[in-house]
């Protein structure tokens, strides 16, 4: 049999070998495609199938506009002028070239030694699905799962049957000061079909700088809290990737799992003291925040407020 590749929406003519070019002809076309469940023999007189597959006067079969459901096998059996039976067999596959792929949400720059999302390559409207590949400085990037990570997603349109492909590239550049060029290409995997390439993006790789300051936020403001209240300490740091955060109380590390938030519920006097957080960045040493003081007091330092509950538990008014 012969393999035929046809573009979706385009006409396709399959010739019936051995068939006389003009009637009278003895021929039979049958097909097994997404429109059939088994073999469908086409009527030489024509009929409802003519909109998808029509026998022409010369015995050829015309598919006016090939679709995904027309993929399959087409066979013609003809008797030539000498009375010999001649068979033609075609395996038809269809394709659709998508629009030019695009890199969406590209990074503005990259930071050395840490994972960076380069961007997401998107291709819309392909059939079959095809593949997306990333290139670095013109060379194919092979994802290794460590320095080069690719996250892929394929979706199929419920009505058209065409595919949308997405590929998200994350890299860990080894050194700063370079200007790598990334591009993405789509390939259908069909012979004689060149890949479609995105416009390249050139990114600057900077060395990871020290975190731009570290702040310790306290809630309630001022760090004064009544017994049984809750204190929330938040270590705010503008570093990427987020560093590990440990906590210190009165100069001693607290035996807690690293976390940028320290929650002190139902505080008592034993929770009073000076707190700070220490951020440890992979490429830099530890950085400590300015300290904050936590004080546990009934109603502050001014003495009982007017209308407060006295020792007797009764409300008193001055």
């Amino acid at each position: 049999g012969q393999n035929i590749t046809a573009r979706i929406g385009e006409p396709l003519v399959l010739s019936c070998k051995g068939a006389p070019k003009k009637p009278p002809q003895q021929l039979e076309w049958k097909l097994n495609t997404g429109r059939t469940e088994a073999w469908k023999v086409l009527s030489p007189q024509g009929g409802p199938w003519d909109s998808v597959a029509r026998i022409l006067p010369n015995g050829s079969l015309l598919l006016p506009a090939t679709g995904i459901v027309d993929e399959g096998t087409f066979r013609c059996r003809a008797t030539n002028r000498r009375g010999k039976e001649v068979k033609s067999n075609y395996r038809v596959r269809v394709y659709q070239i998508p629009g030019k792929p695009e890199i969406v949400d590209p990074a503005s720059e990259l930071t050395a030694s840490v994972p960076n999302k380069v961007g997401t390559c998107v291709s819309e409207g392909s059939y079959p699905a095809g593949t997306l590949s990333w290139h670095l400085d013109g060379k194919l990037l092979i994802p290794d799962g460590k320095e080069t990570l690719v996250k892929e997603e394929t979706r199929r349109h419920p009505e058209t049957g065409l595919f949308t492909l997405r590929s998200e590239l994350t890299v860990i550049p080894t050194q700063g000061g370079t200007h790598p060029t990334f591009s993405c290409s789509f390939s259908l995997g069909l012979p004689r079909r060149r890949p479609l390439n995105t416009a390249p993006i050139q990114l600057r790789v900077r060395e990871p700088g020290p975190p731009e300051g570290i702040q310790l936020l306290v809630e309630p403001e001022g760090g004064i809290v009544a017994p049984g209240g809750t204190v929330t300490l938040t270590c705010a740091i503008s570093a990427q990737p987020p560093p590990q955060v440990h906590w210190i109380k009165d100069g001693a590390p607290l035996p807690l799992a690293p976390s940028p938030v320290l929650l002190l519920p139902e505080v008592g006097h034993e929770d009073e003291g000076t707190y700070s957080c220490v951020a440890t960045h992979p490429s830099h040493g530890p950085q400590e925040s300015p300290p904050v003081s936590i004080r546990v007091t009934e109603t502050g330092d001014e003495g009982p407020a007017e209308g407060s509950v006295g020792e007797s538990g009764l409300g008193t008014l001055a």
């Epitope: 429109r35 469940e37 469908k40 009527s43 024509g46 409802p48 199938w49 909109s51 998808v52």
Partner: antibody, heavy 119, light 107 residues
Framework: EVQLVESGGGLVQPGGSLRLSCAAS????????MTWVRQAPGKGLEWVAS????????YYPDSVKDRFTISRDNAKNSLYLQMNSLRAEDTAVYYC????????????WGQGTLVTVSS | DIQMTQSPSSLSASVGDRVTITCRAS??????VNWFQQKPGKAPRRLIY???NLADGVPSRFSGSRSGTDFTLTISSLQPEDFATYYC?????????FGGGTKVEIK
């Protein structure tokens, strides 16, 4: 909204002629095959003629072949049925329907026009 | 030519009943069968296309099924507005053939 409106029905003598029209709106007319279906009084539905979207190919059952001609004018979004040599058994309500090929059969129908063949 | 033998030709049923109408094709027509509903003095309305697919705007109590050359229209719970005549149509081969119709009447 898809609309099909038939016209041209009436009383005609046996052996006479009549031309039915169907005005289509609400869809891209030249993307669809079109069909005429009839229904004799108190009887079932019978396929009369179909035409492909370009108008190049027409199809008929033996009962009307060589007497009826289906045609279309895509510029006017109109479908026609020229009926010649009419017989008493052609008396029916004639419906215009969208479709007729394997992609969807018939999905929309007009309200019908009555043709009465009687002396 | 293909024959579409529809049965029963008429039936009496009550509101809420489950109703089944069958068409048998004299030869293989694939899934190229439609079902229509027709009320007196009105044009047919498509209910089911390609044997099993519910047409737009048709209530889900209507369903179509197929077993070889046997096609079935089922109304799961008959409603007052469902009393009408139902037709099947094969559109796999010319001449296109309708079933003889099934009139669903109130018991």
């Amino acid at each position: 909204e898809v609309q099909l409106v038939e016209s041209g029905g009436g009383l005609v003598q046996p052996g006479g002629s009549l031309r039915l029209s169907c005005a289509a709106s609400g869809f891209t007319f030249n993307n669809y095959w079109m069909t005429w279906v009839r229904q004799a009084p108190g009887k079932g539905l019978e396929w009369v003629a179909s035409i492909d979207n370009s108008g190049d190919n027409t199809y008929y059952p033996d009962s009307v072949k060589d007497r009826f001609t289906i045609s279309r004018d895509n510029a006017k979004n109109s479908l026609y049925l020229q009926m010649n040599s009419l017989r008493a058994e052609d008396t029916a309500v004639y419906y215009c329907a969208r479709g007729g090929d394997i992609t969807n059969g018939f999905d929309y129908w007009g309200q019908g026009t009555l043709v009465t063949v009687s002396s | 030519d293909i024959q579409m033998t529809q049965s029963p030709s008429s039936l009496s049923a009550s509101v809420g009943d489950r109703v089944t109408i069958t068409c048998r094709a004299s030869q293989d027509v694939g899934f190229y069968v439609n079902w229509f509903q027709q009320k007196p003095g009105k044009a047919p309305r498509r209910l089911i296309y390609r044997a099993t697919n519910l047409a737009d705007g048709v209530p889900s109590r209507f369903s179509g099924s197929r077993s070889g050359t046997d096609f079935t229209l089922t109304i799961s719970s008959l409603q007052p507005e469902d009393f009408a005549t139902y037709y099947c149509l094969e559109f796999d081969e010319h001449p296109l053939t309708f079933g003889g119709g099934t009139k669903v009447e109130i018991k």
